[in-house]
């Protein structure tokens, strides 16, 4: 079992993740682990020498880079916020700020926009991943209501008047809650006819 550096006639290395082919010497050499970079290239008699990334820089993968990447903050102007800091082994982790969704994607999200409002009587369909797409508004299910224009308001169950020792004065709709009244209160005049029936 050869250890790097070793000769390779077919230009491939046994461990593609941790080794790379060096064409000048036609050998396989070790890559540097995450959080490090190549400080001295390999030769036929000496393997790659790696050094730790300096503060504020990183390399995420096994690599044969001669520099580390500079850490960059998430861009708040683009609607992004940080969920995890940059370390020597990973870049800053970003996501869309609350109430926003990813509108431009290039390997990662680069630009977030405000979620659109869902009108009364609807709510945003719950997604697997927050911030991945704009709201898709769906009607409140039976027995529920939502009375605002909002990107995040959820449909709530109608109040059950009997649970509060009250009686229903007006039924709930998708956009409004049930109206309850004291059982001893007289009905308003416009509703008294319906009671007589």
């Amino acid at each position: 079992q050869a250890v790097p550096p070793y000769a390779s006639e077919n230009q491939t290395c046994r461990d593609q993740e941790k080794e790379y082919y060096e064409p000048q010497h036609r050998i396989c050499c070790s890559r540097c682990p995450p959080g490090t970079y190549v400080s001295a290239k390999c030769s036929r008699i000496r393997d790659t020498v790696c050094a730790t990334c300096a503060e504020n820089s990183y390399n995420e993968h096994w690599n044969y880079l001669t520099i580390c990447q500079l850490c960059r903050p998430c861009d708040p102007v683009m609607g992004l916020e940080e969920i995890a800091p940059c370390t020597s082994k990973r870049k800053t982790q970003c996501r869309c700020q609350p109430g926003m969704f990813c509108a431009a994607w290039a390997l990662e999200c680069t630009h977030c926009e405000l979620l659109s409002d869902c009108p009364p009587g609807t709510e945003a369909e719950l997604k697997d991943e927050v911030g991945k797409g704009n709201n898709h508004c769906v009607p409140c299910k039976a027995g529920h209501f939502q009375n605002t224009s909002s990107p995040s308001a959820r449909c709530q169950p109608h109040t059950r008047c009997e649970n509060q020792g009250l009686v229903e004065a007006a039924p709930g709709t998708a956009q409004s809650d049930t109206t309850c009244k004291n059982p001893l209160e007289p009905l308003p005049p416009e509703m008294s006819g319906t009671m007589l029936m």
Epitope: E55, N56, P73, D75, P76, I83, A84, P85, T87
Partner: antibody
């Protein structure tokens, strides 16, 4: 060498605000995050939030959101932490710290006492 | 938020003793854990980052280990200047969180 010099101790009344400063030197102020952490004997160390002086953007711990404001003045390489609506539980030592895989550099701390 | 549960909360030991402090994260934090020493009236002192990397100037008797959720700080031979409170911290995700601290006292 990296130095973080903080303002002096403060005694405040409940309901008031306090503003603590942290002057940085020995490095490029705009390229490193500056955090604020507090220590109270009963509660241990608590992370409050950070500022990235390069774009003067701050992020906060939800626990302090609405009460804490972190700002920075690039011209003087100084960061500030203002805590409002003070209560007795805010009596603590407040530290600024520069981050990189933890907090390698800390200020000496500013003692804030909240008492009526 | 990620909880960092540190144990023990205090311990009594003698000069020369081997001391072990553990920290358990409520979820996987990789190796993104630091350890600090704090003495009354002083700023916390950074001892370890990346779970096991010892900062320059920190004596070799201090060592850190662990990954994922379980982490350990070991002082191989306790010295008089080591009597202090020790904290672990995760910097894997915001909000950063600390353990409650372990006070190392003289027996």
């Amino acid at each position: 060498q990296v130095q973080l010099v903080q303002s002096g101790a403060e005694v405040k009344k409940p309901g008031s605000s306090v503003k603590v400063s942290c002057k940085a030197s020995g490095y490029t102020f705009t390229t490193y995050y500056l955090h604020w952490v507090r220590y109270a004997p009963g509660q241990g160390l608590e992370w409050m939030g950070w500022i990235y002086p390069g774009n003067v953007h701050a992020q906060y711990n939800e626990k302090f959101k609405g009460r804490v404001t972190i700002t920075a003045d690039k011209s003087t390489s100084t960061a500030y932490m203002e805590l409002s609506s003070l209560r007795s539980e805010d009596t603590a030592v407040y530290y600024c710290a520069r981050s990189w895989e933890g907090f390698p550099y800390w200020g000496r701390g500013t003692t804030v006492t909240v008492s009526s | 938020d990620i909880q960092m549960t540190q144990s023990p909360s205090s311990l009594s030991a003698s000069v020369g003793d081997r001391v072990t402090i553990t920290c358990k994260a409520s979820q996987n934090v990789g190796i993104n854990v630091a350890w600090y020493q704090r003495k009354p009236g002083d700023a916390p002192k950074s001892l370890i980052s990346s779970a096991s990397y010892r900062y320059s100037g920190v004596p070799s008797r201090f060592s850190g280990s662990g990954s994922g959720t379980d982490f350990t700080l070991t002082i191989s031979s306790l010295q008089p200047e080591d009597f202090a409170t020790y904290f672990c911290q995760q910097y894997d995700t915001y909000p950063f969180t600390f353990g409650q601290g372990t006070k190392v006292e003289i027996k």
